[in-house]
């Protein structure tokens, strides 16, 4: 694949990454699939600076990120180590709350209205952010 040196149209460049911000909501799994088919991934927040950048663009709206614990431990979708990495949970979160009445706990992380993170039911239709790194090899074949 060819190396991506600039961001696709409608994506925002920041610190050698490209970001795309949705305007509507999808369940976490649909958002995850959307990003991957764009040769990207749900946003992975690795620093306070990146947190502030994303927060500035999404505003006070619940928005999915690429962090989940659907298979047990918390994992970032790109393999970034969760335990040693940046975290910005709200106080007493994540709590895997079962009291919502929707079945199961809360396995997917999102930005809340103040930017801090919460775990929630993955089926909720929240906005989402895709991220892809510049200078990585693109998987896209030539367009026909």
């Amino acid at each position: 694949g060819s190396e991506r040196t600039c961001c696709p149209v409608n994506w925002v460049e920041h610190e050698r990454s490209c970001y795309w911000f949705s305007r509507s909501g999808k369940a976490w799994a649909d958002a995850d699939n959307y990003c991957r088919l764009e040769d990207a991934h749900l946003v992975v927040v690795t620093s306070w600076e990146e947190q502030k950048f994303v927060q500035h663009h999404i505003g006070p709206v619940n928005t999915w990120m690429g962090l989940h614990d659907q298979n047990g431990p918390w994992k970032w979708v790109d393999g970034t180590d969760y335990e040693t990495g940046f975290k910005n949970w709200r106080p007493e979160q994540p709590d895997d709350w079962y009291g919502h009445g929707l079945g199961g706990g809360e396995d997917c992380a999102h930005f809340t209205d103040d930017g801090r993170w919460n775990d929630d039911v993955c089926q909720r239709p929240y906005r989402w952010v895709c991220e892809t790194e510049l200078d990585k090899a693109s998987q896209e074949p030539p367009l026909l």
């Epitope: 696709p8 409608n10 509507s24 799994a29 649909d30 088919l37 896209e140 367009l143």
Partner: antibody, heavy 113, light 107 residues
């Protein structure tokens, strides 16, 4: 509510062309990748083509590459499929779908002399 | 290309029966699989996404399970409106591919 309405199907001779349209409403069209799927009479479903939300990235099934062109107009909430060099085996009901979530009712394309 | 096989191809059942349909992928597809219901002359309707998530508005008698290569759709107690054709769709990579479908009719 979400609606996808296909149009443009009909009877066409082998070698002919047809342009299908899909009018979308009830959701944020520019936040969805779109796909075309077809179903030949009495057969299973077959994926035809994909277009990213921006319209930049496009993929096609091998048997349709070079003959079919997918496009979209986000300002008009519309998806299109230009089909050229049509063959009898392209006879099918053609569905548009938003992501893999919402599907239209389909439009019938018949290729026959 | 990823091939999807589905079994059974058809089944006869009664109202209240528990029905299970299986799709197998020729290679791993994570959980990028949806289950759909289609009635004659109607648009397909998504029941399950991400292999196990119930689509909003779909009755809880429908459930999905599996990951990787083997996936199951279960209807816990078949209702009259559930007699239809069911198919799976993998969308982890291009080309997207469908299972051939399972027709569920009245015994």
């Amino acid at each position: 509510q979400v609606q996808l309405v296909e149009s443009g199907g009909g009877l066409v001779k082998p070698g002919g062309s047809l342009r299908l349209s899909c009018a979308a409403s009830g959701f944020t069209f520019s936040d969805y990748y779109m796909i075309w799927i077809r179903q030949a009479p009495g057969k299973g479903l077959e994926w035809v083509s994909y277009i990213s939300s921006s319209g930049i990235t496009k993929y096609y099934a091998d048997s349709m590459k070079g003959r079919f062109t997918i496009s979209r107009d986000n300002a008009k909430n519309s998806l299109y499929l230009q089909m050229n060099s049509l063959r009898a085996e392209d006879t099918a009901v053609y569905y548009c779908a938003a992501d893999t979530i919402y599907w239209g009712q389909g439009t019938l394309v018949t290729v026959s002399s | 290309d990823i091939q999807m096989t589905q079994s059974p191809s058809s089944l006869s059942a009664s109202v209240g029966d528990r029905v299970t349909i299986t799709c197998r992928a020729s290679q791993g597809i994570r959980n990028d699989l949806g289950w759909y219901q289609q009635k004659p002359g109607k648009a397909p309707k998504r029941l399950i996404y991400g292999a196990s998530n119930l689509q909003s508005g779909v009755p809880s008698r429908f459930s999905g399970s599996g990951s990787g290569t083997e996936f199951t759709l279960t209807v816990s107690s078949l209702q009259p409106e559930d007699f239809a054709t069911y198919f799976c769709l993998q969308h982890t990579s291009f080309p997207f591919t469908f299972g051939p479908g399972t027709k569920v009719d009245i015994k």
